[in-house]
């Protein structure tokens, strides 16, 4: 039975040209994390593998940095970066846990961080 929960940074906003950290945290399970995938809609951004380390997709290499931790840093943000981001935790023996983050990239300097929320 899958008992874990993923906490994410939730709905967040950031300024165009700036950077943002996408963070997920898996808790309430004894399962072992073997890999975390970061995706934007259906596009793979990066993989953090427990054994092999980080792999950033070639098309995002210039603007995506690994970490902190299992998180992902997006740099040089554009309005086109607005949208849904997913962290997908592959865990043994539970299976996959998915967290969702919505990022809004704003033209002005009124960007504020949204509240944290939980996804079961």
């Amino acid at each position: 039975m899958m008992t874990g929960t993923i906490e994410t940074t939730g709905n967040i906003s950031a300024e165009k040209g700036g950077s943002i950290i996408l963070q997920c945290h898996l808790s309430s399970t004894t399962a072992q994390v073997t890999q975390v995938n970061w995706e934007q809609q259906d596009q793979l951004l990066a993989i953090c593998n427990a054994d092999l380390g980080w792999h950033i997709s070639p098309s995002f290499k210039d603007r995506v940095a690994p970490g902190p931790g299992l998180g992902l840093t997006l740099q040089s943000l554009t309005v086109n970066d607005t949208g849904e981001y997913f962290c997908i935790y592959h865990t043994y023996p539970d299976g996959t846990y998915t967290g969702r983050i919505f990022l809004e990239v704003l033209e002005s300097s009124v960007a504020e961080h949204g509240a944290r929320f939980q996804i079961p």
């Epitope: 039975m1 899958m2 004894t30 399962a31 072992q32 994390v33 073997t34 890999q35 593998n49 427990a50 054994d51 092999l52 592959h90 865990t91 043994y92 023996p93 539970d94 299976g95 996959t96």
Partner: antibody, heavy 122, light 107 residues
């Protein structure tokens, strides 16, 4: 070469305890979960449970709670199975096996120890 | 718990034969299934994972198929060393059970 090497066969009396070791080499020990599997003479494979090599947290299958303890010593890349209050029905070959594969759909026990025969007899 | 039922339990065949072993799950397990080969007195050896992916170093005469609840292991042309026991295992959550085994014997 990725391998798991287990301790040798053991003959024990009922009521005694036994510890089986499983030494890993050729890979990052804490990156892969470790499982324990029992095979009684003439019988099939029985999953006993597993241990999270990252946190040391063990999980036991029903029927393998109480007398069975999984543990780790990450400094020497070794997993242990301890069985206390041994009974004749504990006579079996015990295997350690690594969970290979990185994604949920590719998990499998890809590397196995050679097995340790534990015989319980008075 | 998800139960796996292998059939047949015993299979008699000859060198060169094509044989198929079936593994049925008591509920849907997607493609989270592995097949192992075990020689007497030895540790099991992984043949197939993710229902159909051949493990590195395993001869191509072995193949796996299926998804959901029904899976098969096929040996296209039996070799003398293939007359041993085969197990399926699901890895769809906890607990990860094995089938009861299929022993392939020489006819």
């Amino acid at each position: 070469e990725v391998q798991l090497v287990q301790s040798g066969s053991d003959l024990k009396k009922p009521g005694a305890s036994v510890r089986v070791s499983c030494k890993a080499s050729g890979y990052t020990f804490t990156s892969y979960p470790m499982n324990w599997v029992r095979q009684a003479p003439g019988h099939g494979l029985e999953w006993m449970g597993w241990i999270n090599t990252n946190t040391g947290n063990p999980t036991y299958v029903q029927g393998f709670t109480g007398r069975f303890v999984f543990s780790l010593d990450t400094s020497v890349n070794t997993a242990y199975l301890q069985i206390s209050s041994l009974k004749a029905e504990d006579t079996a070959v015990y295997f350690c096996a690594r969970t290979g594969g990185h994604t949920y759909d590719s998990y499998a026990f890809d590397v196995w120890g050679q097995g340790t025969m534990v015989t319980v007899s008075s | 718990d998800i139960q796996l039922t292998q059939s047949p339990t015993f299979l008699s065949a000859s060198v060169g034969d094509r044989v198929t072993i079936t593994c049925r799950a008591s509920q849907v397990i997607s493609s989270s299934l592995a097949w192992y080969q075990q020689n007497p007195g030895k540790a099991p050896k992984l043949l197939i994972y993710a229902a159909s992916t051949l493990q590195s170093g395993v001869p191509s005469r072995f193949s796996g198929s299926g998804s959901g609840t029904e899976f098969t292991l096929t040996i296209s042309s039996l070799q003398p060393e293939d007359f041993v026991t085969y197990y399926c295992q699901h890895l769809h959550g906890y607990p990860s059970n094995f089938g009861q085994g299929t022993k392939v014997e020489i006819k």
